[in-house]
């Protein structure tokens, strides 16, 4: 039994996610469930460090993208939220919030100027930004 | 084999919009961002913007945005930048190239067009 | 904007010696093990053509004649032994940060 919740202020198009807690979930109430993952879109913003901390609070992380095939519906999102992808100037690599490097052909970095910090944008683009900017955010939470 | 064809040249008169044409072949368009410079006689390259025909996401060189804008029409596998309010400063050759993601980055340009010469002029 | 500054802006070379053309870029454009310079060759009324792809990698057909080297802020490309067929300006583009920023080119003459 599938029911379908429409977003249609975060994504580009209609999206069914599947809700029915038999294939998907825990998450916390009004989360958002999708192939063993649980996602909340925040609406208000804050800088990557409150976005961080803000998402910690609720025993979860910023938005790690690890699969695109597991996380496609991040495919359609609307606009630019934060994410866990922050840039080590010491040794030049792009870390999640877990320690974990960045996978190769996940996300396309796009840097603009001075920034460390990555926001989510459609079609698994990850867009630099200065961490003390305001921004929209994503936490998550893995099922398994 | 891949190519990027461009029109040889548009003249154009001041004050007027042009829309330059890349039309890809040899590949599968959606899967390489498409990227646009200008050269004007007897200097060296500019880079304009690009866009990624899968999404229609773009970036600008911010001396170039309100000046340029870049679309796609993936059915016919065709790019395409408008330059808008032309002046003489606009008078140049301009190219399209095919950007390829190398997995982190859009980090380099390997097919290039013939390039399109826009000569503004009353 | 990351700035590439080439030198030498212009370079007479005597057929088959070694040539070499420096791009400095004002910030570092290496990353995750990467450098995001490339190197192009442009002749006189054609688009410019690939000759090298991060930094040292050599571009599908381009002759062994051409390589590149370098990390971080500085990069060279040499050409060696120089032939006829060089004469040309030569890029490098960065490929790190939007604008995306080419150097202002080196033009390659024969003695």
């Known amino acids: 039994i599938w029911s379908a919740v429409f977003l249609n202020s975060l994504f580009n198009q209609e999206v069914q996610i599947p809700l029915t807690e038999s294939y998907c979930g825990p998450c916390p109430k009004n989360w958002i469930c999708y192939k063993n993952n649980c996602y909340q879109f925040f609406d208000e913003s804050k800088n990557w460090y409150e976005s961080q901390a803000s998402c910690m609070s609720q025993n979860a992380s910023l938005l790690k993208v690890y699969s695109k095939e597991d996380q496609d519906l991040l495919k359609l999102v609307k606009s630019y939220h934060w994410m866990g992808l922050v840039h080590i100037p010491t040794n030049g690599s792009w870390q999640w919030e877990d320690g974990s490097i960045l996978s190769p052909n996940l996300l396309t970095i796009i840097e603009m100027q001075k920034g460390d910090c990555a926001l989510y944008a459609s079609s698994f683009k990850g867009y630099i930004e200065n961490c003390s900017t305001p921004n929209t955010y994503i936490c998550m939470q893995r099922t398994v | 084999q891949v190519q990027l064809q461009q029109p040889g040249a548009e003249l154009v008169k001041p004050g007027a919009s042009v829309k330059l044409s890349c039309k890809a072949s040899?590949?599968?368009?959606?899967?390489?961002?498409i990227q646009w410079i200008k050269q004007r006689p007897g200097q060296g390259l500019e880079w304009i913007g690009e866009?990624?025909?899968?999404?229609?996401?773009?970036n600008y060189n911010q001396k170039f945005k309100g000046k340029a804008t870049l679309t796609v029409d993936t059915s016919s596998s065709t790019a395409y930048m408008q330059l808008s309010s032309l002046t003489s400063e606009d008078s140049a050759v301009y190219y399209c190239?095919?950007?390829?993601?190398?997995?982190?980055?859009?980090?380099?340009?390997?097919?290039w067009g013939t390039g399109t010469t826009v000569t503004v002029s009353s | 904007d990351i700035v590439l500054t080439q030198s030498p802006a212009s370079l007479a070379m005597s057929l088959g010696k070694r040539a070499t053309i420096s791009c400095r870029a004002s910030?570092?454009?290496?990353?995750?093990?990467?450098?995001?310079i490339n190197w192009y060759q442009q002749k006189l009324g054609q688009p410019p053509k690939l000759l090298i792809y991060?930094?040292?990698n050599l571009e599908t057909g381009v002759p062994a004649r051409f390589s590149g080297s370098g990390s971080r802020t500085d990069f060279t490309l040499t050409i060696d032994p120089v032939e006829e067929d060089d004469v040309a300006v030569y890029y490098c583009?960065?490929?790190?940060?939007?604008?995306?920023?080419f150097g202002g080119g080196t033009k390659l003459e024969i003695k």
């Open positions: 040899g590949y599968t368009f959606t899967t390489y961002w």
């Open positions: 866009i990624d025909p899968s999404d229609i996401f773009t």
């Open positions: 583009l960065q490929g790190r940060k939007i604008p995306r920023t």
């Open positions: 190239a095919r950007g390829v993601y190398d997995g982190y980055y859009v980090g380099y340009f390997d097919v």
């Open positions: 991060h930094a040292s």
């Open positions: 910030e570092s454009v290496s990353i995750m093990g990467t450098n995001l």
